[in-house]
């Protein structure tokens, strides 16, 4: 067979379709791949054509597209299950050729199977909703092409295993299930059935996606910097370890953004002669607001490090900030000694207990323990 | 350990009401459902409806429609099954029963409470 | 709604003994399909959900077999604390459907 542009195996289009349900699979060929449409290709002689191999297999074959009441048909670019089986699995090819052009592409279509409850081994999208909001609504995914606009479906939603009726606060409005308010109760997979009839049969499309419910940007605040603070004074002897956590809290913002960093002396650390070590630790609220914590550490500190500026920056869609630790070198104590007693006085061991980190304006000694992520 | 602990058992008149109250412990973040079920002396076991604490959600089963009221209070953790229009057949031991999540298939009836016997009798 | 018959209705077995109980669906429920235990003054327990799959803390002697409209409940070696009434219930339709029951009685 003379050559043909293979494309190979798409698998960026790990297509999923339920077991006994309709599907409709265009060629990608001119989805991601070609710079002219179906149509185009048609007018201008161009045939496609469609063959797969089975899964464990690697035997191309035809398919078949004379089985009974057409259950595998194609209609233009579209490769047609009316319903799919679950040895359907496997990969697809569609090529596009004439007696002096050809280009082909394979994808993977997995036919995967749900229990009465919904679950299944599909990747569900994520839909997120903002909390205590307003109304706000989903819509009932991937249900276009299916049929035309004169038949009218039924669609149910459900929550799980259970059918959404009587819920406080949310609707279920056709293909939009609508959220009048939501709540963090509100999180969960949320499942459209769409039952419809085509030449005396009845179809059923099934789709479920998951609800997020985040932070409402009526909230949102720009990055807040918990530390470090005017309260913490990071005290050190050369020669000991100088670890400064910068830790900032970001409102959820979709699609925002969140940088922390720190600047030494107004330099990236990685601009600085010094042996510095940063670690990153990040966690997220149940509305995925984000606390990242970044462990500023010198492992021996001298005297001009204790010198230098330590500033911990933040940045997000809601803007920027910046706070300098309080940085210095500890005065070694003085040693005082009793006459005749030849031990330390009690100003001494005060001295000693006032180790590392101390908090101006209170008597109170704070041990910090960090953890390395 | 979720438990659910029921009322106690309740003798009543034809043509009144019962209130059954199932209270649950330990529950977990998660929305999930309770189901009512009940049983006639020497009978089997017969499903009435349900309720999601946290969404408000509920169904009845057909014969019971008009007649069954499952209602929960979240702050105290509580369901309640009201019966009305009683008649001695509804004489029967009335569990609650739930799942973990909402997502559980074939686990909704996973723990249940200890039962309450409701006796209609003139 | 689908109708669960279940047979016999009184299995007679002497401890240590094979019980095999059946369950048939008025139409196809799939493997949505739980059997319980019951006690005399007990709550049901959950023993087999989908079909096959022991709950937490089941022995292993109890096994669950069948799908659509056909299935058994199996306990290979009844011990005394299996003596009991034995539900099936299909959760593949609203509503939720018990079957009438078995109940396992020593020989």
């Known amino acids: 067979s003379e050559r043909c542009d293979d494309w190979g195996l798409d698998t960026m289009r790990q297509i999923q379709v339920f077991e006994d349900e309709p599907a409709r699979i265009k060629c990608p060929l001119f989805e991601h791949f070609l710079k002219f449409n179906y149509s185009t290709a048609h007018s201008a002689g161009l045939t496609l054509i469609w063959y797969w191999t089975r899964q464990d297999r690697d035997l191309e074959e035809p398919i078949n597209f004379r089985l009974p009441e057409n259950r595998i048909s194609k209609e233009k670019d579209v490769l047609w299950f009316r319903p799919t089986l679950l040895n359907d699995t496997g990969n697809y090819t569609c090529m596009l050729r004439n007696t002096t052009y050809c280009s082909k592409v394979a994808f993977p279509l997995e036919v995967v199977q749900k229990d009465s409850c919904f679950n299944s081994p599909m990747k569900l999208p994520v839909h997120k909703l903002y909390i205590e909001y307003g109304i706000q609504r989903i819509t009932c995914p991937n249900v276009d092409g299916y049929f035309p606009s004169s038949v009218k479906p039924t669609i149910t939603w459900y929550m799980g295993c259970y059918k959404i009726q009587n819920f406080n606060n949310v609707i279920p409005e056709g293909m939009n299930l609508s959220f009048l308010i939501a709540f963090i109760s509100n999180n969960g997979n949320y499942t459209c059935v769409v039952t419809y009839p085509e030449n005396g049969r009845t179809f059923h499309l099934t789709r479920t996606l998951t609800v997020k419910v985040v932070g409402s940007p009526k909230n949102a605040v720009p990055p807040v910097i918990h530390s470090p603070n005017d309260h913490v004074v990071y005290e050190k002897e050369p020669g000991e370890e100088l670890l400064i956590p910068c830790t900032v809290y970001f409102s959820f913002l979709m699609d925002s953004r969140n940088e922390v960093w720190w600047t030494i002396d107004g330099k990236k650390p990685d601009d600085i002669p010094i042996d510095v070590t940063i670690n990153e630790s990040i966690s997220h609220s149940r509305t995925e607001d984000e606390t990242r914590t970044q462990i500023l550490s010198i492992k021996k500190v001298t005297s001009e490090d204790l010198k230098r500026s330590y500033v911990c920056h933040a940045r997000s869609a809601k803007g920027e900030v910046a706070k300098a630790a309080t940085v210095k070198q500890k005065v070694p104590a003085p040693r005082y000694t009793v006459e005749g007693g030849g031990g330390t006085g009690g100003l001494n061991d005060i001295f000693e207990a006032q180790k590392i980190e101390w908090h101006e304006g209170g008597g109170h000694h704070h041990h910090h323990h960090h953890h390395h992520h | 350990q979720v438990q659910l602990v029921q009322s106690g058992a309740e003798v009543k008149k034809p043509g009144s009401s019962v209130k059954v109250s199932c209270k649950a412990s330990?529950?977990?973040?998660?929305?999930?459902?309770i189901q009512w079920v009940r049983q006639a002396p020497g009978q089997g076991l017969e499903w009435m409806g349900y309720?999601?604490?946290?969404?408000?959600?509920?169904d009845y089963a057909q014969k019971f429609q008009g007649r069954v009221t499952i209602t929960a209070d979240e702050s105290t953790s509580t369901a309640y099954m009201e019966l009305s229009s009683l008649r001695s057949e509804d004489t029967a031991v009335y569990y609650c029963?739930?799942?973990?999540?909402?997502?559980?298939?074939?686990?909704?009836?996973?723990?249940w409470g200890q039962g309450t016997l409701v006796t209609v009798s003139s | 709604e689908i109708v669960m018959t279940q047979s016999p209705a009184t299995l007679s077995v002497s401890p240590g003994e094979r019980a095999t109980l059946s369950c048939r669906a008025s139409?196809?429920?799939?493997?949505?399909l739980a059997w319980y235990q019951q006690k005399p003054g007990q709550a049901p327990r959950l023993l087999i959900y989908?079909?096959?799959t022991r709950a937490t803390g089941i022995p292993a002697r109890f096994s669950g077999s069948g799908s659509g409209t056909e299935f058994t409940l199996t306990i290979s070696s009844l011990q005394s604390e299996d003596f009991a009434v034995y539900y099936c219930?299909?959760?593949?339709?609203?509503?939720?459907?018990f079957g009438q029951g078995t109940k396992v009685e020593i020989k």
């Open positions: 029963a739930r799942g973990q999540t909402l997502y559980e298939t074939g686990r909704q009836f996973d723990i």
């Open positions: 330990g529950s977990p973040a998660e929305p999930y459902a």
């Open positions: 309720i999601i604490p946290s969404l408000g959600g509920y």
């Open positions: 139409q196809s429920v799939s493997s949505n």
């Open positions: 989908g079909a096959s």
């Open positions: 219930q299909q959760y593949n339709n609203w509503p939720w459907t």
